[in-house]
């Protein structure tokens, strides 16, 4: 029987009974937060063979092994993952071994086994036989292997029953528990699964099978399951569902997700029955089961119950994430905030249409309105008193409305009002009148020429760059000397630069009045000689990276109406030179025969240019004699058993730690200090652990149902 759509067993161990008839869990399985130690021996679920998503175990007191609970769990598909993991075993205080001796395949995702103070038999499992890539596995903070004394079946009697494989250059027996070997299929089967008797399964089987070469005898399917058969693709008129089986149109039409309304059941798209249309697609009509591509961002209509939505913080803006049409009025009142411009763009950047009015007042944190980067229509169906549909009042740092060269905004009905925006040039407002089609609607007092732009350099001249030179991590630029009417009024220049993968940045990107700015700024003093062109060397840059650069002159000059005259350059895009790439990542090698090595790696994190080829070098090394010397049964006394506390920052040491040799001197001395790189790696590791733990807690601690 298929169970699902995800089973959460918590607080009461008797809830495990829900798994009684399950052969496949279509979804995840959580077993967690059972604080009272119970006897689990009477609970056994031999029918369960497949979990299509992930298995999560967290704080289950008294559970010592999973082998008795799930003796036949064969495949965890990882169709959806828990923070990139298909198997998570976390803070299981009494777990002594995993014991999933029939687990043969984790199709997608990695494993995370962490802070299980009594957990052994971890180094005896060869995860590479179960997962495609083991590099992302995270097995930390469990019982130290030297305190475990893990023995595979028959080792003590010198009649080992399990097969050997090599992990980290250690060739050893592979087992799940003291009496269960890790199953391996004959090499003749290649990637295929095999029966208990080592006969090869049908290629469409995954994990195991009850009869050889039979696509109806699979324990699980490599691709899809339909009407009792494992198939490479779903037959005509059936659709992939939950990553593992095929269903017909009627079935897909009949199911609903936990949150959806009846009209928003599942859809069929690209041969799959899925909960929602994928990103970039929308239903072809409200009752439709089919998806069509969106033109531009997919529409999402958001409505404010109270008609006017006040945006006074990032939190309030968050409610508008993904909205493309806002039914109502926007009142923006952002007095302070951290990194406010990019946060607002993140949450409001998709809004294209506002049906009512837009009012921006007392928003001293705003330098630009470019965070509304897709706004193209203000309908003005509702207007402020005086028939205003765009109202901008008392914004002390507002300098730019939008980049009018790349912006088409229409105000369908209503007037504009601007007052007390001391850094907003009137020319910017007049430009908006032209673009939005509101020219002629405003009366004389609606755009105040005295108190808008009174503290801005509104009459801008253009600065021209004269030369640019680049190396792998430097850019040298020079520009024409700016000559204002009175030379004494030129104070200095400011150079702004930042990484710009695309040539689409504007001066006000990511900038707010509270100190956040996506641009790096460097002040450049005037050259003492009037004939020398000003310039700057920008250093510490990344190789093969495009940067955007512009320069502003800082002046004192006043022109008519006491407005300041200034100068700035256009934005210049310039790329640094290429350099040597960083090292390739995750290099893995394995032997698939006596004369071949297979080497895999991931590209370098910093290619520093266009990668054209890799160089692979190898050399023969002498056999490590240690592999043959090591005999478990005669090894030194096992260290005093110390109960692991589940912490992971220190490896327990039972002997004198002063044994490392530093420099040329022999004899005991202190461990060498950690390098900066090691310290950084440790810091990142600790951070990563915190992030995962937060994710875990946020995911599983939920309010009690009412």
């Amino acid at each position: 029987e298929i169970c699902g759509p995800g089973i959460d067993i918590r607080n009461d161990y008797q809830q495990l009974k829900r798994l009684e008839n399950c052969t496949v869990i279509e979804g995840y399985l959580h077993i967690l937060l059972i604080s009272k130690a119970e006897d689990y021996r009477s609970y056994r679920f031999p029918k369960l063979t497949v979990i299509t998503e992930y298995l999560l175990l967290f704080r289950v007191a008294g559970l010592e092994s999973l082998g008795d609970l799930f003796p036949n769990l064969t495949v965890i598909r990882g169709w959806k993952l828990f923070y990139n993991y298909a198997l998570v075993i976390f803070e299981m205080t009494n777990l002594k071994d995993i014991g999933l001796y029939n687990l043969r395949n984790i199709t997608r995702g990695a494993i995370r086994i962490e802070k299980n103070a009594d957990l052994c038999y971890l180094s005896t499992v060869d995860w590479s036989l179960i997962l495609d890539a083991v590099s992302n596995n995270y097995i930390v903070g469990n019982k130290p292997p030297k305190e475990c004394g893990d023995l595979c079946p028959g080792t003590m009697e010198e009649k080992p029953m399990c097969e050997k494989t090599t992990i980290n250059n250690e060739y050893n027996y592979r087992c799940w528990t003291t009496n269960r070997c890790q199953k391996m299929c004959p090499s003749t089967c290649g990637k295929r699964a095999c029966t208990e008797n080592n006969e090869c399964c049908h290629p469409e089987c995954l994990g195991s099978c009850s009869a050889p070469d039979n696509d109806t005898a699979c324990v699980a399917c490599r691709h899809y399951y339909y009407a009792g058969v494992c198939v490479p693709a779903c037959p005509p008129n059936t659709y992939r569902f939950e990553g593992w089986r095929c269903v017909d149109r009627d079935f897909c039409a009949n199911i609903l997700s936990a949150e959806s309304s009846d009209s928003e059941g599942f859809v069929i798209h690209d041969g799959e029955c899925m909960q929602e249309c994928p990103s970039g697609f929308i239903r072809n009509g409200s009752q439709s089961m089919y998806c069509i591509p969106c033109e531009g961002p997919c529409p999402k209509v958001c409505e404010e119950e109270k008609k006017t939505k006040t945006i006074d913080s990032v939190t309030s803006a968050q409610m508008l994430q993904g909205c493309t049409i806002f039914k109502g009025n926007l009142l923006i009142n952002i007095r302070r905030g951290n990194n406010i411009a990019s946060e607002l763009e993140n949450f409001m950047g998709l809004i294209e249409v506002v049906t009512g009015y837009v009012k921006i007042r007392h928003s001293h944190a705003l330098v630009s309105l470019s965070f509304l980067k897709n706004l193209r229509l203000i309908l003005g169906e509702e207007q402020l008193e005086g028939n205003y549909s765009f109202y901008v009042l008392d914004n002390q740092n507002l300098q730019q409305l939008w980049d009018w060269d790349h912006r088409n905004l229409t105000i369908k009905a209503g007037k504009m009002y601007f007052a007390f925006n001391p850094k907003l040039c009137v020319s910017e407002i007049y430009r908006m009148e032209e673009v939005t089609g509101t020219k002629g609607r405003q009366s004389k007092g609606d755009i105040n020429t005295r108190n808008n732009g009174e503290r801005a350099s509104c009459e801008s001249d253009v600065l021209h760059f004269t030369s640019t030179t680049t190396s792998k991590n430097r850019i040298i630029i020079t520009w024409h000397r700016y000559r204002p009417p009175d030379y004494r009024d030129l104070i200095s220049f400011t150079v702004y630069y930042k990484e710009a993968p695309f040539k689409n940045v504007t001066e006000y990107d990511g900038q707010d009045a509270c100190g956040s700015n996506s641009w790096n700024m460097v002040d450049v003093d005037l050259p003492p000689n009037k004939d020398v062109e000003p310039g700057i060397l920008l250093h510490g840059l990344k190789p093969w990276t495009q940067y955007a650069v512009y320069v502003k002159a800082v002046t004192l000059t006043m022109v008519e109406n006491d407005h300041i005259r200034g100068a700035k350059s256009e934005i210049l895009y310039i790329r640094t030179n290429a350099s040597v790439p960083s090292i390739p990542l995750d290099v893995l090698s394995a032997s698939n025969s006596s004369s071949q090595l297979i080497v895999k790696w991931n590209p370098p994190s910093l290619p520093n240019g266009n990668l054209s080829y890799y160089i692979v070098r190898w050399q023969r090394q002498p056999q490590d004699g240690y592999l043959y010397r090591h005999n478990y049964c005669s090894k030194d006394k096992i260290p005093i058993r110390k109960y692991a506390d589940g912490t992971i920052d220190i490896e327990e040491v039972t002997e004198n730690p002063k044994t490392e040799v530093c420099g040329g001197e022999k004899g005991p001395c202190c461990a060498c200090p950690k390098t900066e790189a090691e310290k950084q790696a440790e810091k990142e590791e600790a951070e990563y652990r915190k992030v995962f733990e937060n994710f875990l807690h946020n995911s599983i601690f939920v309010p009690r149902p009412e």
């Epitope: 009949n254 199911i255 997700s257």
Partner: antibody
């Protein structure tokens, strides 16, 4: 196309048993419950119970619990309904109707019905 | 058992006129998750029943939009905005929320 084909009419004596079959085609038999609904002449519809073809799990209307047995044969995609100890008021048309087998939220309706099998109980 | 009571039991209608059938359950058929499994079926003379409306108000595919369902809790209604000759037959409401699932006794719609 999707259809449910039922066995032919039956005439039975009181106290006897009848076994009605319903053969499914055009869809995956194990993806849907099979329900049985009956209708006495000139009367309304009455739900008798259903069966999960995957594991043979049944859900019976208490009224018929002691007399009815529902089974399936997945190899032939056929569902069976056996009614024992027949009485004259069991004379009715017996319909099979499918219903999605899904543990999450679904729309849950009888979207496909058989043509019905008339069972007459008469001495 | 939940009893489903329909009214009227007979409904003569002139073609083109609207029609309304009421169905009342003896107790609430709303499930704990808020879902209400109330359906309407039409059985035309000599045929098997066919689905019209599911979950109170949703038209099944291929059902003309002159059919609509509404209601909540224990009171439900099926409306036909303009009756046509092909709409004749017996209309049944059905609750699939609580075992044993039960049908209403049926409303016979006939053309005047």
């Amino acid at each position: 196309q999707v259809q449910l084909v039922q066995s032919g009419a039956e005439v039975k004596k009181p106290g006897a048993s009848v076994k009605v079959s319903c053969k499914a085609s055009g869809y995956a038999f194990t993806d849907y419950y099979m329900n049985w609904v009956r209708q006495a002449p000139g009367q309304g519809l009455e739900w008798m119970g259903n069966i999960n073809p995957n594991n043979g799990g049944t859900n019976y209307n208490q009224k018929f619990k002691d007399r009815v047995t529902m089974t399936t044969d997945t190899s032939t995609s056929t569902a069976y309904m056996e009614l024992r100890s027949l009485r004259s008021d069991d004379t009715a048309v017996y319909y099979c109707a499918r219903w999605i087998l899904y543990y999450g939220r679904s729309k849950w309706y009888f979207d496909v019905w058989g043509r019905g099998t008339l069972v007459t109980v008469s001495s | 058992d939940i009893v489903m009571t329909q009214s009227p039991l007979s409904l003569p209608v002139t073609p083109g006129e609207p029609a309304s059938i009421s169905c009342r359950s003896s107790q609430s058929i709303v499930q704990s998750n808020g879902d209400t499994y109330l359906e309407w079926y039409l059985q035309k003379p000599g045929q098997s029943p066919q689905l019209l409306i599911y979950r109170v108000s949703n038209r099944f595919s291929g059902v003309p939009d002159r059919f609509s369902g509404s209601g909540s809790g224990t009171d439900f209604t099926l409306k036909i905005s303009r009756v046509e000759a092909e709409d004749v037959g017996v209309y049944y409401c059905f609750q699939g929320s609580h075992v044993p699932y039960t049908f209403g006794q049926g409303t016979k719609l006939e053309i005047k």
